[in-house]
Amino acid sequence: MMTGTIETTGNISAEKGGSIILQCHLSSTTAQVTQVNWEQQDQLLAICNADLGWHISPSFKDRVAPGPGLGLTLQSLTVNDTGEYFCIYHTYPDGTYTGRIFLEVLESSVAEHGARFQIP
């Protein structure tokens, strides 16, 4: 029986050009974490494997940094980074736990008014 729960950083609004940390924490289980995948909209961003360490997908290498811990740092944010991010914990013997975080990237100083995304 899966007893664990995932706690996340919570949804985030961030400014274009900035950086944010996405973090998840698995609690209430003694299961062993074998791997954590970070994904966005069916795209794999990064993997942290208990034995092999971190692997960042080549297309995100410039803007994604591992950590802190099992979290992920996104840098040089663009409006196209707006979307839902998933932390997927592979554990033994429980199986898979998934956390969800929505990131909204705003144009600078428009959280209060104005359009959020500008098409170039």
Partner: antibody, heavy 117, light 112 residues
Framework: EVQLQQSGPELVKPGASVKISCKAS????????MNWVKQSHGKNLEWIGL????????SYNQKFRGKATLTVDKSSSTAYMDLLSLTSDDSAVYYC??????????WGQGTTLTVSS | DVVLTQTPLSLPVSFGDQVSISCRSS???????????LSWYLHKPGQSPQLLIY???NRFSGVPDRFSGSGSGTDFTLKISTIKPEDLGMYYC?????????FGGGTKLEIK
């Protein structure tokens, strides 16, 4: 003036599908997230999901995965929600609502869906 | 999913009254950056819901200053200082901090 104009009431048979539209005006359509909300029994509000007109990205409430499909047509500044395999439980008022920083600042007038044989 | 519990379910009032509506969350609504995405809405019969307050205490444009929001963590309150006829309807809180967003069950503000 920001306006979200939704399509009219629908009466459909169980098992059928329906497409509800939400035409936006008075602002940059691609600049804001569009949310969809279900109101059952004239009271309970449930978030169905959202779509990001800028890049087509979606996020769904797990409860509505497979039931609702969200799309947009940027050229007409219109958001759509397809509701599939309808049952009487889907009878409700459905709203589109513009989102910014996890608040819904403008809402459509609502579309009443009645599923009945 | 995060559960928002609103109290009271029904609030009979007289015009001119001051009232408070409570919204309690099953977990903290503060994200790791200190933002709390808790908003309040009024749904009048035959109309669309309208945004009153966002991020706990910020009044949306055009909302009268008799509406105010407060709270932190898991406990939030909407206060209406002097009830007017146009304030009658259903009030809902909404949390946007955790996926999926969830609404409170609503509080009906009605005349005594």
């Amino acid at each position: 003036e920001v306006q979200l104009q939704q399509s009219g009431p629908e009466l459909v048979k169980p098992g059928a599908s329906v497409k509800i539209s939400c035409k936006a005006s008075g602002y940059s359509f691609t600049g804001y997230i569009m949310n969809w909300v279900k109101q059952s029994h004239g009271k309970n509000l449930e978030w169905i999901g959202l779509i990001i007109p800028y890049n087509g990205g979606t996020s769904y409430n797990q409860k509505f995965r497979g039931k609702a499909t969200l799309t947009v047509d940027k050229s007409s500044s219109t958001a759509y929600m397809d509701l599939l395999s309808l049952t009487s439980d889907d009878s409700a008022v459905y709203y589109c609502a513009r989102g910014l920083s996890y608040r819904y600042d403008y809402w459509g007038q609502g579309t009443t869906l009645t599923v009945s044989s | 999913d995060v559960v928002l519990t609103q109290t009271p379910l029904s609030l009979p009032v007289s015009f001119g009254d001051q009232v408070s509506i409570s919204c309690r969350s099953s977990q903290s609504l503060a994200n790791s950056y200190g933002n709390t995405y808790l908003s309040w809405y009024l749904h009048k019969p035959g109309q669309s819901p309208q945004l009153l307050i966002y991020e706990i205490s910020n009044r949306f444009s055009g909302v009268p200053d008799r509406f105010s929001g407060s709270g932190s963590g898991t406990d939030f309150t909407l206060k209406i200082s002097t009830i007017k006829p146009e304030d009658l309807g259903m009030y809902y809180c909404l949390q946007g901090t955790h996926q999926p967003p969830t609404f409170g069950g609503g509080t009906k503000l009605e005349i005594k």
